[in-house]
Structures are given as C-alpha cells and as structure tokens.
C-alpha cells in the first residue's frame, strides 16, 4: 500500500498547525515539564512498513481523541482546531485504506498489539497529567509541544519508510 504524497504534505500541515496553536511560550512553563515516556522503540527503524501502519494509525487516532475533548476546545483557537481535525481525519483515512488492504494483518500480530498498547498507555499518561494539572494553560502547552515532538518523530518514520521502498 502506497500512502499518497498528499499524506506527507498533510503531516507537515499538521505540524504547522500545532506550531500555530501555541498560545504561551514553553519557556514560561519550565516547572510544568514532564517526561511522558514516548514509546520511541515502537517507531524504530527495525519495523517493516506493514507493522508500522497500524501503530501510526493508533498514534493519530489518539491525537484526534486528545484534541477533540471539551477541555481541549476551551484551550485552543477554534479555527485552528477545526483545520487540525481536518488534517488528522485525512491522515486517518489514508492509513485506514492501507489497513483495509490487509497490509500486515497476518504479520507479527502480537508485536503490533504490544506497540498499539504502548501508544495507548502513552496517551493515558498525557491525559492523566492534564487532569492532575487541572487543564492549565501551561499543562496544555507542555502537551502541545510533546505532541509536536512525538508526531514529528512518527512523521520522520513515515518518510524513512517511503525512502526505503
């Protein structure tokens, strides 16, 4: 399954929107910084394309879920958030098309399930952090920056998979 070129452009637009969403400086939130334990090993180069697509899909689905809550809507600019949803939705569609084509369905299912679980736990930690910090502006900024970094890393993986073909 070949992800369309528009998928890469969409990823870049998503990162750009995340950057534009910034309301306060991360530098002002030093005391609120947290290591969420991004499961980088689940996005390692040892993965085959077939194994990464469901993990990437899970990552984007979780980002969508995180930013489509009531608390998120109150924290971010509505226009930017709507554009952000649209980009994520398009990427989910692209990845779902690959999953439907049966890519990797029979390959290392346990490995994939473990990876998807690791991504879910990562987002659970983020959600718990926001709750503990009472969804403060600094907590949301720390999370926005974290999602930018982790999404960027997963985007880099997509690019490296594309270049290996």
């Amino acid at each position: 399954c070949d992800l369309p070129q528009t998928h890469s452009l969409g990823s870049r637009r998503t990162l750009m929107l995340l950057a534009q969403m910034r309301r306060i400086s991360l530098f002002s939130c030093l005391k609120d910084r947290h290591d969420f334990g991004f499961p980088q090993e689940e996005f390692g180069n040892q993965f085959q394309k077939a194994e990464t697509i469901p993990v990437l899909h899970e990552m984007i689905q979780q980002i969508f879920n995180l930013f489509s809550t009531k608390d998120s809507s109150a924290a971010w600019d509505e226009t930017l958030l709507d554009k952000f949803y649209t980009e994520l939705y398009q990427q989910l569609n692209d990845l779902e098309a690959c999953v439907i084509q049966g890519v990797g369905v029979t390959e290392t299912p346990l490995m994939k399930e473990d990876s998807i679980l690791a991504v879910r736990k990562y987002f659970q930690r983020i959600t718990l952090y926001l709750k503990e910090k009472k969804y403060s502006p600094c907590a949301w900024e720390v999370v926005r920056a974290e999602i930018m970094r982790s999404f960027s890393l997963s985007t880099n993986l997509q690019e490296s998979l594309r270049s290996k073909e």
């Epitope: 910034r22 530098f27 910084r33 290591d35 980088q40 920056a145 982790s150 890393l153």
Partner: antibody, heavy 120, light 107 residues
C-alpha cells in the same frame, strides 16, 4: 537573516563589574527567550543564564547566581548580562543564543562570542 | 541538577566511517536533548533538537535518537568538515546542562 552580535572583548580585575550586550536582528526579538552560554579556555560549554521573551522570567546557573543579572530591552532588540563580583573562573568566551521553544527548547542561533578575561 | 555524561570523550576516525556518540542523563528528560557541533574558535552549531529532529540546513548524514536517559548522535559517513567537538545539552530542567563533549579527530 538572524544575527546576534555581542559587545567587544574585555579585561577586568577580580571583584570588578562588567555589562555584556548582545544586539539581535532578523527576527521578532520579543517573541523569543534568550540565553547566555560561556566557555572557559580549553574547556567545555557551560550554560549561564536565560530570560523569557517578556523578561518576566529569569534563570541562572548556581555558579553565577547572586552575581550575574540577565535582562533585555525589547525596544532596542538587545540582551544584557550584568556581571558583578567577577572571579578568575569567570574568564571565558561568552555567547548569547536565541531559544526556540516551538516544540522543545533549543538554542538555534548563536552570536560569535566575546572574550571576558578576569585577571589581576 | 541533571548531570550529562558523554562517551567516548574523544575518538579517532577516518573519512567515510560511521561514528556514534552517546549521551546519558542522570534522570529522565523525555526528548529535551539537543546536539551541537563546535569547531575551534567558532560558536557552537545546532545539529539535532528534541533528540531526533534534524535542524534545517544540517546534512542528513547526522541523525539523533533516544528518549528518557539514553541518547545517540550518529554520523553515517564522516566527512572532512565533521572533525570537531560534539556536545549534548539537556533543556528539560534548569540549570540547563551540557555534556563534557566528544572530540572527533582524524585517524
């Protein structure tokens, strides 16, 4: 084009004072945190201090706390480091650096450095 | 304070070699880790930010990986202009701290 230009080299006696300045151009100065980093001759890099874009938040290394003060004048696009009670161990090349905080915190642009020598 | 250690402290390599430098933090710092290159008499130059992001204009032979406490800078094929000293920097907490540096020289 982003440019950071530190003031000229200085020689001071122990116990003396000095103010370093760093003139910034090519970007919206007030939107960025700024930092000072130093390097003693033949040694590694040491972070000294940082200041938020508005100037409201400042941070210092323990080695300079209480002696050095970081400040900025956003109307003049200039960063400062006021150095008091200078010691021989403050002898170093001092760099000013811009802090990018869009997704992480990193010093993306640096000045050319200015040598401060503290000697009797 | 967060301590940063780097290994090796120096290495000799030839043009075309694959070079790996590691940096370890004394506590978890997420991906708040940056890599710099410095040549004698020059200001440091940002290579990698947020552990794995290549700074604009930096050749793709440089790459970074890691999160938490262990990080790696890799130069896939060493070029003549890459002989320099490399530093890691954590910006998770103040005081921000640099690693002691790794000097890469010609074998």
């Amino acid at each position: 084009e982003v440019q950071l230009l530190e003031s000229g080299a200085e020689v001071k006696k122990p116990g003396g004072s000095l103010r370093l300045s760093c003139a910034a151009s090519g970007f919206t100065f007030s939107s960025y945190a700024m930092s000072w980093v130093r390097q003693a001759p033949g040694k590694g890099l040491e972070w000294v201090s940082a200041i938020s874009g508005s100037g409201g938040s400042t941070y210092y290394a323990d080695s300079v706390k209480g002696r050095f003060t970081i400040s900025r004048d956003n109307s003049k696009n200039t960063l400062y480091l006021q150095m008091n009670s200078l010691r021989a161990e403050d002898t170093a090349v001092y760099y000013c650096a811009r802090v990018d905080s869009s997704s992480s915190l990193h010093f993306d642009y640096w000045g050319q450095g200015t040598l401060v020598t503290v000697s009797s | 304070d967060i301590q940063m250690t780097q290994s090796p402290s120096s290495l000799s390599a030839s043009v075309g070699d694959r070079v790996t430098i590691t940096c370890r933090a004394s506590q978890r710092i997420g991906t708040y880790l940056n890599w710099y290159q410095q040549k004698p008499g020059k200001a440091p130059k940002l290579l990698i930010y947020a552990a794995s992001n290549l700074q604009s204009g930096v050749p793709s032979r440089f790459s970074g990986s890691g999160s938490g406490t262990d990080f790696t800078l890799t130069i896939s094929s060493l070029q003549p202009e890459d002989f320099a000293t490399y530093y890691c920097l954590q910006t998770f907490n103040t005081p921000f701290t640099f690693g002691p540096g790794t000097k890469v020289d010609i074998k």
